[in-house]
């Protein structure tokens, strides 16, 4: 596949399950992968009766859904887990739900956080 045009080296990191997994809760993540693999950022969340629960953010490895996407946009209609991915450093800071079948676009703005670098 090869590395993409908008090369991803770092992503926003977040883990709602950080205590159980013994990781940081939030910060920055450096992406790693073999030379022939494209690297992406992702965000995943749940929508419980209109309340957004952020689940994870971080790096994602070589996925055609993410190729050449500058913004993190989830397109599935009504999934159990919302997921978007994109290419470019920190492109997962903001994330959006825009179902392919049409409907309102909803963009989620991140709360300001002090960055912590994860490797």
């Amino acid at each position: 596949s090869g590395r993409g045009e908008a090369e991803t080296r770092e992503c926003i990191y977040y883990n709602a399950n950080w205590e159980l997994e013994r990781t940081n809760q939030s910060g920055l993540e450096r992406c790693e992968g073999e030379q022939d693999k494209r690297l992406h950022c992702y965000a995943s969340w749940r929508n419980s009766s209109g309340t957004i629960e952020l689940v994870k953010k971080g790096c994602w490895l070589d996925d055609f859904n993410c190729y050449d996407r500058q913004e993190c946009v989830a397109t599935e209609e009504n999934p159990q887990v919302y997921f978007c991915c994109c290419e470019g450093n920190f492109c997962n800071e903001r994330f959006t739900h825009l179902p392919e079948a049409g409907g309102p676009e909803v963009t989620y703005e991140p709360p300001p956080t002090a960055p912590t670098l994860l490797t």
Epitope: E21, T23, K37, G58, W60, L61, D62, F64, Q80
Partner: antibody, heavy 120, light 107 residues
Framework: QVQLQESGPGLVKPSETLSLTCAVS?????????WMWIRQPPGKGLEWIGS???????YYNPSLKSRVTISVDTSKNQFSLKLSSVTAADTAVYYC?????????????WGQGTTVTVSS | DIQMTQSPSSVSASVGDRVTITCRAS??????LAWYQQKPGKAPKLLIY???NLQSGVPSRFSGSGSGTDFTLTISSLQPEDFATYYC?????????FGGGTKVEIK
Amino acid sequence: QVQLQESGPGLVKPSETLSLTCAVSGYSISSGVYWMWIRQPPGKGLEWIGSIVHSGHTYYNPSLKSRVTISVDTSKNQFSLKLSSVTAADTAVYYCARAGKYRWHGMDVWGQGTTVTVSS
Amino acid sequence: DIQMTQSPSSVSASVGDRVTITCRASQGISSWLAWYQQKPGKAPKLLIYAASNLQSGVPSRFSGSGSGTDFTLTISSLQPEDFATYYCQQAPDLPITFGGGTKVEIK
């Protein structure tokens, strides 16, 4: 409903090329999902061989990459596997499967599997 | 490659028993794990994806939990049709890898 059907020779000679096809019915292969090949040697576990998407992007298991080619034929709604220079270690049940839009959705539809024996 | 280790490799249980199977990843995979059931001579069947999401049509006695490196598949009350081999599979890394399987046998 979605159905996958593997086809190809059940016996392949060592050093030859194994060729299998997976015919997809009830679903367009051009939809934005992953199409997978997985194999299972007799009495053993599952091994991912590789994946392809409608655009032709392929993803291969590095342990087999030098010998594997996966291709898609959207006009026939099918995808294929070629594995070259086979040995007895390639004897297995070969499955084709559909995964979701993303890898993490899991492989929700499988073919029934076809047994391939490598022997002279 | 991420190694997936399942335990136990086999378990004997009776109808109505609660059965728990564990899967450990050699490095963190967040919640991106699937579970499959396979019966002899048949293709695997997807039970759970994203660690805890039940695939459509799968009975609610199956449940999944865990994140990071440690995951669990639980069958709350074992039914006769549940005797099979179960596999976990990680999704975020390439190559995709499976656990070695856990065979649930009749006691």
